[in-house]
């Protein structure tokens, strides 16, 4: 099943205390999903979509980009007949980078 | 029912210091699904976003007013408060508090405090 | 002043369908999703509309938003009294890095 797009809400980060909000998408035929959130590979959190919405924020705590591991990606699940679970693909990558200081 | 309630004075003098307070009614200050922000309507004149807040303190402002604005959070009385300093009468407006959503992929300004009236005058 | 420009006013007879238009530009329409708010005289604001075209729970199916480039707009259909307040878009602006507004549009419901 198609992959969900993946977006970093506003306001994005300006240091690495601030939290980082990744919004993940399904298409539009495929509400009430399951979410993962991923950071190189590593879960770092699951939300259900509500029934009647195709998406979800994630909502990280500032801090959260100090986790070594590379990009953020989404990925979504639903139940496909006879109630099997089917995943979506990986989302595109995300990257958080933060401005360069200018003192 | 979430309620927000905005108290402060209703009259400010030029070149002086204005300090609202929110009190959020209903639910925790403390979510990570919400920011907490402020919006003015001068007399007249549209909607104007101030700045916003979140639960751990990370804030971000209107560019046009950054210079004058501070706004804090105090979890343990469930408030936030805009601090604008040195105001002028183009300051003299509506205040409100209100409540930033991050659901569904996006966010949006769920609930609002009714407003209080703020004029600035010598 | 705002970079999402609205038409001052618009009017309609009860039960007609009227549309308020919200131009802006790639760094905040373009790029993001948009919010419609009413706003009723001597009251606080309320959500109509978010990511463009959803509705909130309560609201009425009268209301109903869409987005094209970097313009969006409201239709409110079946016009009521109760409908008479000013409405606005908003989203995100890359550029100013923060939230906007629109100028505003005052619907005046005839007869």
């Known amino acids: 099943i198609p992959a969900p797009s993946i977006r970093l809400v506003p306001p994005y980060p300006s240091s690495q205390e601030d939290p980082i909000h990744i919004a993940c998408m399904a298409p539009g035929n495929f509400p009430g999903a399951n979410f993962t959130l991923y950071r190189g590979g590593q879960v770092v959190q699951l939300l259900q979509a509500p029934t009647d919405q195709r998406g979800v924020t994630f909502n990280l705590s500032g801090g959260s980009s100090k986790a070594p591991g590379g990009p953020f990606h989404c990925q979504y699940g639903v139940l496909g007949e006879l109630n099997q679970s089917q995943l979506s693909d990986l989302s595109e990558p995300v990257n958080v980078s933060f401005p360069v200081p200018t003192w | 029912q979430v309620t927000l309630k905005e108290s402060g004075p209703a009259l400010v003098t030029p070149t002086q210091n204005l300090t609202l307070t929110c009190t959020v009614s209903g639910g925790s200050i403390s979510s990570s699904s919400y920011y907490w922000g402020w919006i003015r309507q001068p007399p007249g004149k549209g909607l104007e976003w101030i700045g916003s807040?979140?639960?751990?303190?990370?804030?971000y402002y209107n560019p046009s007013l950054k210079s004058r604005v501070t706004i804090s959070v105090d979890t343990s009385k469930n408030q936030f408060s805009l601090k604008l300093s040195s105001v002028t009468a183009a300051d003299t407006a509506v205040y409100y508090c209100a409540r930033r959503r991050n659901s569904s992929g996006w966010f949006y300004f769920d609930y609002w405090g009714q407003g209080t009236l703020v004029t600035v005058s010598s | 002043q705002s970079v999402l420009t609205q038409p001052p006013s618009v009017s309609g007879a009860p039960r007609q369908r009227v549309t308020i238009s919200c131009s802006g530009s790639r760094s905040n329409i373009g790029d993001n999703a948009v919010n419609w708010y009413q706003h009723p005289p001597g009251k606080a604001p309320k959500l109509l509309i978010y990511y463009d075209d959803l509705l909130p729970s309560g609201v009425s199916d009268r209301f109903s938003g869409s987005k094209s480039g970097t313009s969006a707009s409201l239709a409110i259909s079946g016009l009521q009294s109760e409908d008479e307040a000013d409405y606005y878009c908003a989203t995100w602006d890359d550029s100013l890095n923060g939230h906007v507004f629109g100028t505003g549009t005052k619907l005046t419901v005839l007869g």
């Open positions: 807040i979140y639960y751990s303190g990370s804030t």
